[in-house]
């Protein structure tokens, strides 16, 4: 999916009120410094197209991000500010229900989540910069 | 400290495929950033071609996007470049890297293929 | 597409002596640049990252500076080892990062 069409705006409303509280909570107990940050993202597009492979990919060691509140609202976010994409979800759809049901918080899981924050820290960073 | 080595043909015939593999020691490519490769053809600059996340996402440049393929092997700690439809202009040292997604950290030290029949 | 353009081309001096090297970006890239140094039949090595920071194991000597279309490398005082091909690369314009055609530090 091409999140060039989407309305950035709406989207850092949307995380600053709930996802960023969602991942926070998510991450509580555990300090910013525990995880180094290995991915980044150069302009809003590419934030958006990292942030949702990050979120809705599993990956072999955490493999439940999906199932998560925090990627139930990134994806409704991003359904409803990005034309179209709602449509080209069908093969994540099916990953969410494929993700484990247990709610066990790896470290491997906190690791990906951190780089997440991340993720949506540079895309807020990148639309002040645009403003 | 994390170290790359790139192998495949020296010699490739126009209009074949070109495949590369980069094997990755001192980090597991599973575990974080990502993994890019980059071309320099002889006397000239920098190209970048593409790179791979650990989580799996994919991103390559638009100019040369129709004919490369970006994989991976976790279980060898190596990933690999398919270049298709070769010319003399794809003749280049090729250079795997280690990537953030914006800029590159570490590389491998680069090999020599030459698109020739 | 972004086009870097380095100057100059050929830069030719003395150890000991200060280098300042020029890239300048086709549009505004903001601080998303880096600067790589290369060697003879060596890869390129990350010198500088974001416009300003230095990588890991990069010596004081190595600075950059700049933000939206004009930057510059500066060698505060060029040892033996710093004679090679340096090269700008922005990071502002995904899909499409862009690297400058270099500029070679010679010994004069």
């Known amino acids: 999916y091409d999140f060039t069409n989407c309305d950035f705006q709406k989207i850092e409303a949307d995380y600053l009120r709930t996802i960023s509280k969602d991942l926070i909570t998510y991450m509580s107990g555990t300090k910013s410094t525990d995880f180094n940050n290995t991915v980044s993202c150069s302009n809003r597009p590419h934030c958006l197209t990292e942030i949702q492979s990050l979120t809705f990919n599993p990956t072999p060691r955490c493999a439940s991000l999906a199932k998560e509140m925090f990627a139930r609202k990134t994806k409704a976010t991003l359904a409803l500010w990005c034309p179209g994409y709602s449509e080209t979800q069908i093969n994540a759809t099916q990953a969410m229900k494929k993700a484990r049901k247990s709610k066990v918080t790896t470290n491997k899981c906190l690791e990906q989540v951190s780089q997440l924050l991340g993720l949506w820290r540079r895309f807020i960073r990148t639309l002040l910069k645009k403003q | 400290q994390v170290q790359l080595q790139e192998s495949g043909p020296g010699l490739v015939k126009p209009s074949e495929t070109l495949s590369l593999t980069c094997a990755v020691s001192?980090?597991?490519?599973?575990?974080?950033?990502?993994w890019s490769w980059i071309r320099q053809p002889p006397g000239k600059g920098l190209e970048w071609i593409g790179y791979?996340?650990?989580?799996?996402?994919?991103s390559y440049n638009p100019s040369l996007k129709s004919r490369v393929t970006i994989s991976r092997d976790t279980s060898k700690n190596q990933f690999s470049l398919k270049l298709s439809s070769v010319t003399a202009a794809d003749t280049a040292v090729y250079y795997c890297?280690?990537?953030?997604?914006?800029?590159?950290?570490?590389w491998g030290q680069g090999t020599l293929v030459t698109v020739s029949s | 597409e972004i086009v870097m353009t380095q100057s100059p081309a050929t830069l030719s001096l003395s150890p000991g002596e200060r280098a300042t090297l020029s890239c300048r970006a086709s549009?505004?890239?903001?601080?998303?640049l880096a600067w790589y140094q290369q060697k003879p039949g060596q890869a390129p090595r990350l010198l500088i990252y974001?416009?300003?920071s230095r990588a890991t194991g990069i010596p004081a000597r190595f600075s950059g500076s700049g933000s939206g279309t004009d930057f510059t490398l500066t060698i505060s005082s060029l040892e033996p080892e710093d004679f090679a091909v340096y090269y700008c690369?922005?990071?502002?314009?995904?899909?499409?990062?862009?690297f400058g055609q270099g500029t070679k530090v010679e010994i004069k």
């Open positions: 890297a280690r990537t953030n997604l914006l800029y590159f950290d570490s």
């Open positions: 001192g980090y597991s490519i599973s575990s974080g950033y990502g």
């Open positions: 791979f996340s650990y989580y799996g996402s994919t």
């Open positions: 549009q505004s890239v903001s601080s998303n």
């Open positions: 974001d416009a300003s």
């Open positions: 690369q922005q990071y502002s314009n995904w899909p499409q990062y862009s």
